[in-house]
Interface confidence: medium
């Protein structure tokens, strides 16, 4: 798995403190939880709760641990081999196309739609048209489930719980 690593992702360079474990690189790579020394001779362990590395690597620095934003809860802490796992608070969600923030879930469906999916930390509520309703003319919707809107379209509010 490859990832673009930007300068701000990297923890500030620090000299190897005495408590940091060292080992030798294997074929030029250091194991998860370590980074390589500047001279390439040693693997230096990441600092628990501060930085991490998830794969065999030749990084000069471990990656900085993510801090959960306000509006997020920490599901699991950062370890030397795994980044912090953050999740949106109840009633909010993070979309794939806008992962930078948690957004408030919508409060309900429009008339004529039913809620088929609840608010989760990764998705808004899901609303779909009532495919079984009748058209305003009194006809049953055709196979393609076409519905036309009009003031007379049968409709009832869906649950407003988020």
């Amino acid at each position: 798995e490859s990832a673009l690593i930007t300068q701000q992702d990297l923890a500030p360079q620090q000299r190897a403190a005495p408590q940091q474990k060292r080992s030798s690189p294997s074929e030029g790579l250091c194991p998860p939880g370590h980074h390589i020394s500047e001279d390439g001779r040693d693997c230096i362990s990441c600092k628990y709760g501060q930085d991490y590395s998830t794969h065999w690597n030749d990084l000069l620095f471990c990656l900085r641990c993510t801090r959960c934003d306000s509006g997020e809860v920490e599901l699991s802490p950062c370890t030397t081999t795994r980044n912090t796992v953050c999740q949106c608070e109840e009633g909010t969600f993070r979309e794939e196309d806008s992962p930078e923030m948690c957004r408030k879930c919508r409060t309900g469906c429009p008339r004529g739609m039913v809620k088929v999916g609840d608010c989760t930390p990764w998705s808004d509520i899901e609303c779909v048209h009532k495919e079984s309703g009748t058209k305003h003319s009194g006809e049953v919707p055709a196979v393609e489930e076409t519905v036309t809107s009009s003031p007379g379209t049968p409709a009832s509010p869906c649950s407003l719980s988020g």
């Epitope: 196309d97 919508r106 469906c109 429009p110 739609m113 048209h129 495919e131």
Partner: antibody, heavy 118, light 107 residues
Framework: QLQLQESGPGLVKPSETLSLTCTVS??????????WGWIRQPPGKGLEWIGN???????YYNSSLKSRVTISVDTSKNQFSLKLSSVTVADTAVYYC??????????WGQGILVTVSS | EIVLTQSPATLSLSPGERATLSCRAS??????LAWYQQKPGQAPRLLIY???NRATGSPARFSGSGSGTDFTLTISSLEPEDFAVYYC?????????FGPGTKVDIK
């Protein structure tokens, strides 16, 4: 980042059918959470919702246009289309495609001006 | 159908001033109201959904309030890029309808 792009002829003759396609990139049209819609805006005027479609093909139309509108979806091409029949000069507008999140339009195409003229 | 009325039609203000835009619905739409910004030659952009929730990328100076039939969009301090047309849209019932818009222009 999700992007939508309208395409089709910019000039349609009166009484003919206006046909537009919206291509979705950066995301799947087969999302269970979203409908895909068309909105139009006559020059210098406000916005009018035309209708929307679900990836399974179910459609919902504005009753003021229902007799002339067909919206369809092609999930294999990540596209959805608008057909508006028997057009008149009053159908001259910028036509936008957009994604509906529940029932607000959170991603829009840049719009395509369609002029109805002989 | 639910008719939305926006006022004023035009609002002339200077950068740095506070803008207050109104949207009134012909019947209750609960909190199911959105606000959009449209600049000349561009598509509308979602600013606020469900009356008061800021959409992704919407600056903090934009805030929405109201429920039922009366809604307000407030721009706390106008930036040069905020001069545009603002539309409200209801999603309480079908057809989805938009207000006629309020143009915010430079005094």
């Amino acid at each position: 980042q999700l992007q939508l792009q309208e395409s089709g002829p910019g000039l349609v003759k009166p009484s003919e059918t206006l046909s537009l396609t919206c291509t979705v990139s950066g995301g799947s049209i087969s999302s269970r959470s979203n409908y895909w819609g068309w909105i139009r805006q006559p020059p210098g005027k406000g916005l009018e919702w035309i209708g929307n479609v679900y990836y399974r093909g179910s459609t919902y139309y504005n009753s003021s246009l229902k007799s002339r509108v067909t919206i369809s979806v092609d999930t294999s091409k990540n596209q959805f289309s608008l057909k508006l029949s028997s057009v008149t000069v009053a159908d001259t507008a910028v036509y936008y495609c957009a994604r509906l999140s529940v029932a607000e339009f959170d991603y829009w195409g840049q719009g395509i001006l369609v002029t109805v003229s002989s | 159908e639910i008719v939305l009325t926006q006022s004023p039609a035009t609002l002339s203000l200077s950068p740095g001033e506070r803008a207050t835009l109104s949207c009134r619905a012909s019947q209750s739409v609960s909190s199911f109201l959105a606000w959009y910004q449209q600049k000349p030659g561009q598509a509308p952009r979602l600013l606020i959904y469900d009356a008061s929730n800021r959409a992704t990328g919407s600056p903090a100076r934009f805030s929405g309030s109201g429920s039922g039939t009366d809604f307000t969009l407030t721009i706390s301090s106008l930036e040069p890029e905020d001069f545009a047309v603002y539309y409200c849209q209801q999603r309480s019932d079908w057809p989805l309808t938009f207000g006629p818009g309020t143009k915010v222009d430079i005094k």
